[in-house]
């Protein structure tokens, strides 16, 4: 092809060439043609002869103001076409009259601003239609009954005032899964235009200036459709009351978006008449007081989202919004309540009473005064099935015994990015039976006793990360009742001491966080007492993490029980020798990270069975002695291995001797090394 | 399931040593801290200490920290306790036991070895 | 360390009559404390940990409870085999303090 197109698989890309013509030299039995964002005028039917096989055709972001009606002549297969982000203006009866086997067609952003006629009348296949960002001032796409098979009506983005009967009944056969009408001026709605669609599922009128007024008429002219889904975001809907939605009564809707509405004022059993809702979002509001009614009704409703829904009006403690005792429990089905991001002054002894299906709360930054948890905190929550508490980003300081002692179904905890500063004595956790869970990283420091777990033997995954970490050093060992942990994250904590009994029993562990800590004294021989073999019993270990330790030496043995090792990190530490053999036991090593040492000889000896299996290696940045004995069987290794070693031309550099000083180590020349022979497999 | 075995009485005289034994079994020794418990007739429990028979490192009561040394060796699955310069006070059941799952607890006790301090 | 007291030292009571043993701890134990059971010439048994958690095969008529560094043990129904010696102990760090014990006989 003298184009510049690629094609695989039957499937040509020719964007983004600047073509001002269709190529002619493709091969013949592409079924997928690209020609998006290039500068083609037209699209002349003789050239698609040779493309008969296509099925999609892509022409966005061009400067086509016209289409030959033959086009789709040459194209009997085609059923998905696009024309997005072009010039057409007029659409007459003759332009898509060979295209029969459409499913999509997209035409959105052009400059289409009347349909006259029937253009589509012969789309019986068409399943979505967009024609959004264009300039139409109504919703009359035809004169006659048509488009029966379509299910998604894209309008959004254009000047369409009134949703009128006698445009909307060209789709007296179709059901409509979406109609999509946002970002229009809708004032009206006359009576009976969405009864003259066969069925409508979805609606969507999202940025549509409504308000209460218009809300409560649009759901009068619903009553009695098949609308399931419907959506009114951004439509400046500042309240609710018993009537607004009055008109759904009639209906099954199951889906209700009122998401950056600034709603203000949710008045009381606003939504009894929605018992079949089952998916509610109502995130990014403005409501200053939740009633005990105001959710009334809602006996469905599985997915609540409340983020952002109440926010302070000023600085002043008597504008923080409040959510009245019992407001929740109508919501009998509710599986899953996000309520981030809110300014709620704190939990009240009934606030989350009634919820008995609750699975997943999130809590993150939802409250301005949330200090401590005490066993009374969540004693609402106690007849809810909770499995996942996210209590993020509280400014939480302090944990109470029984704190979490009506969660007993609670799997997952997470407390990170508060402020907790306390000792843990493990009554912290009393009740959490079932609990795989507890992410305490990012808080303010926790000094742990040998009890600080002991209640919760179940917990498979700890993560505390940052936490100034005190007694870790405590023997027994603060870990020793966790023997479920597969994971443990310890890192960043400027640790120091650890006995060698630390993670005894923990043989189920995968995946052991150390990075940024100060462990290094423990590997030296000179240690009193010798190397701190801390990492003994790990028999299931996949990943090990030691970066930013410090660590000058390794002890041969260190890895040795590590026999399901899959990636090690040692990056930036001042590693410069590796005894012989520290990764002879290191059979299932994928990922080998040593980047940022002091590292001048890569042997054979040492590295040789690190390497047998390595998917990963990183070993940029290290002084490399760029002599035989040091490195010539590395660099015959790398030239020959498949094993990705990113940046390899550019950070993996020869620091000595003096004349190869920045030299790529990859170039170094070996054919005058005696005994440089890669290792054989 | 796990047992604790222990030899059911001693007889020693004053100012000498004795060493009792505490044989476990049913699970894997050296994932389970021993600890060591002292009962005079007709009288209370007393904890002694209690040792990682992992790694032999030991936490004793300071009560007991000259009169007991405790020891394992790992090859037999058997913990021991010295006790030395045996006077009537030493006179009493030894019993060896072990936390269970949940670590704030004895569910599993040696049935106990009765030493007499007599001459 | 922490101290132990428990009281009272002896009980006289009655098959079918209901019975309370306290210990109290001189420092806060934080809910780590076990409840035994023992017979003439044998082993303790564990009865109740963690204050208040029943150990596996304890009949339902024991029960634990704790306010403050105060923590019972109640017995309802006495039953023939119920008599013997009754010992608490702390769990909060060492050494693991137990009680003098409770004698409680049959009437």
């Known amino acids: 092809s003298t184009t510049k197109c690629t094609v695989s698989h039957e499937v040509a890309d020719c964007s983004h060439l600047k073509l001002t013509q269709v190529p002619d030299d493709l091969p013949t039995n592409i079924t997928v043609l690209n020609l998006t964002h290039n500068q083609l005028r037209r699209l002349p039917a003789a050239n698609f002869t040779r493309y008969s096989q296509l099925t999609s055709l892509d022409v966005g972001f061009n400067t086509i103001s016209k289409l030959e009606p033959e086009l789709c002549q040459k194209l009997p297969m085609l059923k998905v076409l696009n024309l997005q982000h072009n010039e057409l203006s007029q659409l007459s009866d003759k332009t898509f009259a060979f295209c029969t086997n459409l499913t999509e067609l997209h035409l959105m952003s052009n400059s289409i601003q009347k349909i006259k006629n029937n253009p589509f009348v012969k789309q019986k296949n068409l399943i979505t239609l967009d024609l959004s960002h264009n300039g139409l001032s109504s919703t009359k796409l035809g004169t006659q009954v048509q488009l029966e098979n379509l299910q998604e009506l894209l309008l959004s983005n254009n000047k369409i005032q009134a949703l009128k009967s006698e445009e909307l009944d060209i789709f007296a056969n179709s059901s409509l899964k979406k109609l999509e009408l946002s970002s229009n001026q809708i004032k009206e709605f006359s009576p009976g235009c969405f009864h003259a669609i066969g069925r409508l599922f979805g609606l969507f009128l999202n940025n549509v200036q409504l308000g209460p007024s218009l809300t409560e008429k649009l759901c009068l002219e619903l009553a009695n459709t098949s609308i399931r889904n419907l959506s009114l975001s951004n439509s400046q809907l500042s309240t609710t009351s018993n009537t607004t939605f009055l008109g759904l009564k009639w209906t099954n809707l199951t889906m209700l978006d009122l998401s950056y509405n600034n709603l203000n004022v949710v008045g009381n059993d606003s939504f009894a008449w929605l018992p079949q809702l089952e998916y509610f979002f109502l995130e990014y509001n403005n409501i200053q007081h939740l009633f005990s009614h105001s959710l009334h009704g809602l006996f469905n409703v599985r997915y609540l989202n409340l983020k952002r829904s109440f926010t302070k009006q000023s600085i002043s403690l008597a504008s923080l919004p409040k959510i009245d005792d019992f407001s929740f429990q109508w919501l009998k089905c509710l599986e899953h309540l996000n309520m981030e991001d809110n300014d709620i002054p704190g939990i009240k002894s009934n606030m989350f009473t009634g919820l008995i299906n609750l699975k997943y709360l999130s809590l993150s930054n939802s409250f301005t005064s949330l200090r401590t948890l005490t066993n009374e905190t969540f004693v609402s929550l106690a007849h809810s099935p909770l499995h996942i508490l996210n209590l993020t980003k509280n400014k939480i300081s302090k944990i109470e015994s029984d704190a979490f002692s009506w969660l007993g179904h609670l799997e997952v905890l997470d407390l990170g990015l508060n402020e907790i500063g306390q000792e843990l004595t493990g009554q912290e956790w009393r009740g959490l039976e079932n609990i795989f869970e507890i992410y305490l990283s990012y808080n303010k420091y926790l000094q742990l006793t040998r009890n600080s777990f002991a209640l919760v033997p179940s917990l498979q995954r700890l993560m505390l990360r940052r936490v100034a970490l005190k007694n870790v050093d405590s023997s027994p060992s603060p870990f020793q009742p966790l023997r479920n942990l597969t994971i443990l994250d310890l890192s960043n904590n400027n640790i120091a001491n650890i006995n060698d009994d630390m993670l005894e029993g923990l043989e189920k562990l995968e995946i052991l966080d150390l990075q940024h800590n100060n462990l290094a004294r423990l590997w030296k021989h000179a240690n009193p007492g010798g190397p701190i073999y801390f990492l003994k019993g790990l028999s299931h270990l996949h990943i090990l993490n030691l970066e930013s330790n410090g660590f000058d030496e390794i002890p041969v043995e260190v890895f040795k029980d590590l026999f399901e090792l899959k990636i090690i990190d040692l990056g930036l530490n001042n590693l410069n020798t590796l005894p012989a053999s520290v990764f002879n036991n290191q059979v299932s090593l994928k990922s080998l990270n040593l980047q940022k040492n002091l590292i001048t000889s890569v042997e054979k000896k040492v590295f040789g069975p690190a390497f047998r299996n390595l998917t990963e290696l990183d070993m940029r940045f290290n002084p490399f002695d760029c002599t035989c004995e040091s490195i010539a069987w590395f660099v015959n290794w790398i030239n020959e291995t498949h094993t990705n070693i990113p940046e390899l031309s550019s950070h993996y550099l020869c620091n000595t001797p003096p004349h190869y000083h920045g030299f790529p180590v990859r170039l170094f020349d070996t054919s005058s090394c005696k005994d440089s022979a890669p290792f054989e497999l | 399931q796990v047992q604790l075995q222990q030899p059911g009485a001693e007889l020693v005289q004053p100012g000498t040593s004795v060493r009792l034994s505490c044989k476990a079994s049913?699970?894997?020794?050296?994932?389970?801290?021993i600890h060591w418990v002292k009962q005079r007739p007709g009288q209370g429990l007393e904890w002694i200490g209690e040792?990682?028979?992992?790694?032999?490192?030991?936490n004793y009561n300071e009560k007991f920290k000259t009169k007991a040394t405790l020891t394992v060796d790992k090859s037999s699955s058997t913990a021991y306790m010295q006790l030395s310069s045996l006077t009537s006070e030493d006179s009493a059941v030894y019993y060896c036991?072990?936390?269970?799952?949940?670590?704030?607890?004895?569910?599993?006790w040696g049935q106990g070895t009765l030493v007499t301090v007599s001459a | 360390d922490i101290q132990m007291t428990q009281s009272p030292a002896s009980l006289s009571a009655s098959v079918g009559e209901t019975v309370t043993i306290t210990c109290r701890a001189s420092?806060?134990?934080?809910?780590?404390l076990a409840w035994y059971q023992q017979k003439q010439g044998k082993s303790p048994q564990l009865l109740v940990y963690?204050?208040?958690t029943l150990a596996d095969g304890v009949p339902s008529r024991f029960s634990g409870s704790e306010s403050g560094t105060q923590y019972s043990l109640k017995i309802n129904s006495l039953q023939p085999e119920d008599f013997g010696s009754y010992y608490c102990?702390?769990?909060?760090?060492?050494?693991?303090?137990f009680g003098s014990g409770t004698k409680l006989e049959l009437k």
């Open positions: 420092g806060n134990i934080h809910n780590y």
């Open positions: 040792i990682n028979p992992n790694n032999g490192r030991i």
């Open positions: 049913g699970y894997i020794f050296t994932t389970y801290w």
């Open positions: 102990q702390h769990f909060w760090s060492t050494p693991f303090t």
């Open positions: 036991t072990r936390v269970g799952v949940m670590i704030t607890t004895f569910p599993y």
């Open positions: 963690n204050a208040k």
